[in-house]
């Protein structure tokens, strides 16, 4: 049985031929119309397509598959009957004709037929599985389609209601716009009327101003006449007073000439009973020269003469030597009292210096020096300080020993540069040193990384420009 061949006969039936020695066994099997031809073999493990099939197409294919299944089942049954019939016939023939040693051949033929049957059964099972699989997929697709349809219907309903809402809103807004337009027209008319009234008022005021200007000119002329008269009167009064005092002293030598009261500093003003903060006139020591200063009569017991104040950047502190000498600014606001007056005053007796500082975050600090004085102009108003206490740094931000005063036109610092030019303002610069309370005034949020600002290094560091500073002096024995 070394030759086992499968071929097709003329009428399209499958023909199984077994050759064994001189004997040849042929089995003719019926061919099913709907079974797959050998030219397109069935592949049981073919990958199913992922893309969803069209619904109608899927239904048609299902029906085809069902038909094939039915046909296969019928064919199998026929095949089994056929095999049984043939087996009976062949067995009879074999028993009659075959030699004993051909039993083995028959067994093999039977085995082959059984194998064929098993193969067909397996294929059928695969087809069944695929049909089931496809059916499940179709059911799922149907479910998805119906869900999707429901979702779409809901969305359409939602959008329709949204459109209706928007249309309502639109018509409401249109009404509002129209109402606003009407209102606007009315307002425009009233504004126009007001404008006309204002123009009338302005022209009236212009004529009044012209009249007032004329009156001012007249008043100025009258004022100068009055001033002259007042001056003459004052002279006459003074002459009379002199005459009177002369005659009185001649009559009564015990009555001394009453001297005009003058104050050297705010401590003297305070002691005389003036305890209200404000501007007072002070007199230079050993002189009749006067200077206006602000007196702080409240802070730390009062009696403080303010020699410097920064608070808002309203005054330019980049000034000349002469301006720093005599003072500048407004005593009720930002100002510098004047180096000459401070020098003369602090050389008369021992003074303390208090420096009060404010940052942009609402913090306050102070430095108090228990002994402070300025040298004369010949020594460039050099600063002398001793005994530091306070909250604005443990180390003095005014370099020790003290430096000469420098301005943009008076360079007395220890830098190759002109510190007053670099950092702006007059100060007791070193090279250039840890402080400059007369630097550029920078507003909030622009006050950091400013090396030419209002600096007090040992409180706020290099580039921080302070919000407010006050330098004040008072006799040490107050």
């Amino acid at each position: 049985y070394n030759n086992f061949r499968k071929s097709m006969d003329s009428i399209g039936k499958k023909q199984y031929q077994v050759q064994h020695g001189s004997c040849s066994y042929t089995f003719l099997l019926p061919e099913m119309d709907n079974c797959r031809s050998s030219s397109s073999p069935y592949v049981s493990n073919a990958v199913q397509r992922d893309a969803p099939l069209e619904y109608d197409d899927s239904v048609q294919r299902l029906q085809v598959l069902e038909n094939i299944m039915e046909n296969n089942t019928q064919w199998l049954m026929k095949l089994e009957n056929y095999i049984q019939d043939n087996m009976k016939k062949e067995m009879v023939e074999i028993q009659q004709n075959a030699v004993q040693n051909q039993t083995a051949v028959m067994i093999e033929i039977g085995t082959n037929l059984l194998n064929q049957t098993a193969e067909q059964t397996r294929k059928l099972t695969d087809v069944e599985a695929q049909v089931l699989n496809q059916t499940t997929r179709l059911e799922l697709q149907l479910l998805e389609h119906s869900l999707s349809t429901n979702k779409l219907e809901k969305q359409i309903l939602d959008q329709t209601s949204e459109i209706n809402k928007l249309q309502d809103k639109n018509s409401f807004l249109e009404k509002k716009v129209l109402a606003m337009e009407d209102k606007h027209i009315i307002q425009l008319q009233s504004i126009k009327e007001e404008k006309d009234q204002l123009q009338v008022l302005v022209s009236k005021q212009n004529s009044i101003i012209e009249e007032l200007e004329k009156k001012i000119v007249t008043a100025t002329v009258n004022n100068s006449v009055l001033q002259k008269q007042q001056h003459d009167l004052m002279e006459t009064v003074n002459n009379l007073l002199t005459m009177m005092s002369t005659s009185n002293s001649a009559k009564d030598p015990t009555v001394a000439k009453e001297e005009q009261i003058s104050f050297r500093d705010c401590a003297e003003v305070f002691k005389s009973g003036h305890t209200t903060n404000g501007i007072y006139t002070l007199t230079f020591p050993n002189s009749t020269e006067e200077i206006k200063a602000y007196c702080d009569m409240e802070a730390g017991g009062g009696g403080w003469t303010i020699i410097q104040r920064r608070e808002d950047g309203s005054v330019d502190f980049q000034r000349t030597w002469k301006e720093y000498k005599v003072g500048f600014g407004n005593p009720s606001g930002e100002y510098w009292l004047g180096n000459e007056f401070v020098s003369q005053l602090t050389n008369q007796q021992r003074y303390v210096l208090k420096i009060h500082l404010k940052d942009w975050e609402g913090n306050e600090a102070y430095s108090l020096y228990e002994h402070f004085y300025l040298s004369s102009e010949e020594l460039n108003y050099r600063i002398h300080l001793k005994g530091l206490t306070g909250t604005a740094g443990k180390i003095s931000s005014i370099s020790q020993p003290g430096n000469d005063f420098s301005t943009k036109d008076g360079d007395n610092d220890k830098c190759i540069c002109k510190c007053s030019q670099m950092l702006t303002g007059g100060w007791w610069f070193d090279a250039c040193g840890p402080s400059n309370l007369n630097g550029m005034y920078y507003p909030q949020r622009q006050n950091t990384n400013k090396f030419n600002g209002i600096k007090w290094y040992y409180w706020k560091g290099s580039g921080y420009s302070l919000k407010a500073t006050t330098m004040m002096i008072r006799p040490a024995d107050f």
Partner: antibody, heavy 121, light 107 residues
Framework: QVQLVQSGAEVKKPGSSVKVSCKAS????????MVWVRQAPGQCLEWMGY????????GYNQKFEGRVTITADESTSTAYMELSSLRSEDTAVYYC??????????????WGQGTLVTVSS | DIVMTQSPDSLAVSLGERATINCKAS??????VAWYQQKPGQPPKLLIY???TRDTGVPDRFSGSGSGTDFTLTISSLQAEDVAVYYC?????????FGCGTKVEIK
């Protein structure tokens, strides 16, 4: 002698951060301000910011504001510069340098050897 | 920010000859200008500060001048070791800024 020694080269991914150190020796660390300057390939020198080790005060170039942080550790005399949200344009040599003055950020008299930071994905 | 514009970008000078580098500030910087020398693979080195003051140990062939907006660095007699890139730097106004450098080579 006065010396500034910087940490080694770094390779970083875009979006990450880098922290470069600068150890000072031969002088009192708190007596001078420390600045950081960078030099990108073929670009000008760029001042990034400074720290005053005495009081921890800092100042930054607005160009780097929000991305750069300069700190100092007085105990080890070391200054640090951290740059965050790195981008390829941050590839540069980063230098620390000492200012001649504590009170002002003037000129820079002593420089570190530089740290190459490469930003690449 | 103040812009510091250096000229020329590069300069080739014979040994022993004078080399002049210019730096122009976009606004008045007084005399707050420093000059640095940078050799390949090295950090910058301070040469001049306050426009004209030589730093300690800097040879006297290096000199600086100028004020306001125009500044000059001069190497009176170029030596082989002077081959480098030179930068100007203003520190008058925040933030401090640098020029983009002038490369000095030997002709």
């Amino acid at each position: 002698q006065v010396q500034l020694v910087q940490s080694g080269a770094e390779v970083k991914k875009p979006g990450s951060s880098v922290k470069v150190s600068c150890k000072a020796s031969g002088y009192s660390f708190t007596d001078y301000n420390m600045v950081w300057v960078r030099q990108a390939p073929g670009q000008c020198l760029e001042w990034m910011g400074y720290i005053d080790p005495y009081n921890g005060g800092t100042g930054y170039n607005q160009k780097f504001e929000g991305r750069v942080t300069i700190t100092a550790d007085e105990s080890t005399s070391t200054a640090y510069m951290e740059l965050s949200s790195l981008r390829s344009e941050d590839t540069a040599v980063y230098y620390c340098a000492r200012t001649r003055d504590r009170y002002d950020v003037w000129y820079f008299d002593v420089w570190g050897q530089g740290t190459l930071v490469t930003v690449s994905s | 920010d103040i812009v510091m514009t250096q000229s020329p970008d590069s300069l080739a000078v014979s040994l022993g000859e004078r080399a002049t580098i210019n730096c122009k500030a976009s606004q008045d910087v007084y005399i707050a200008v420093a000059w640095y020398q940078q050799k390949p693979g090295q950090p910058p080195k301070l040469l001049i500060y306050w426009a004209s003051t030589r730093d300690t140990g800097v040879p006297d062939r290096f000199s600086g001048s100028g004020s306001g907006t125009d500044f000059t660095l001069t190497i009176s007699s170029l030596q082989a070791e002077d081959v480098a890139v030179y930068y100007c730097h203003q520190y008058s106004s925040y933030p401090p800024t640098f020029g983009c450098g002038t490369k000095v080579e030997i002709k």
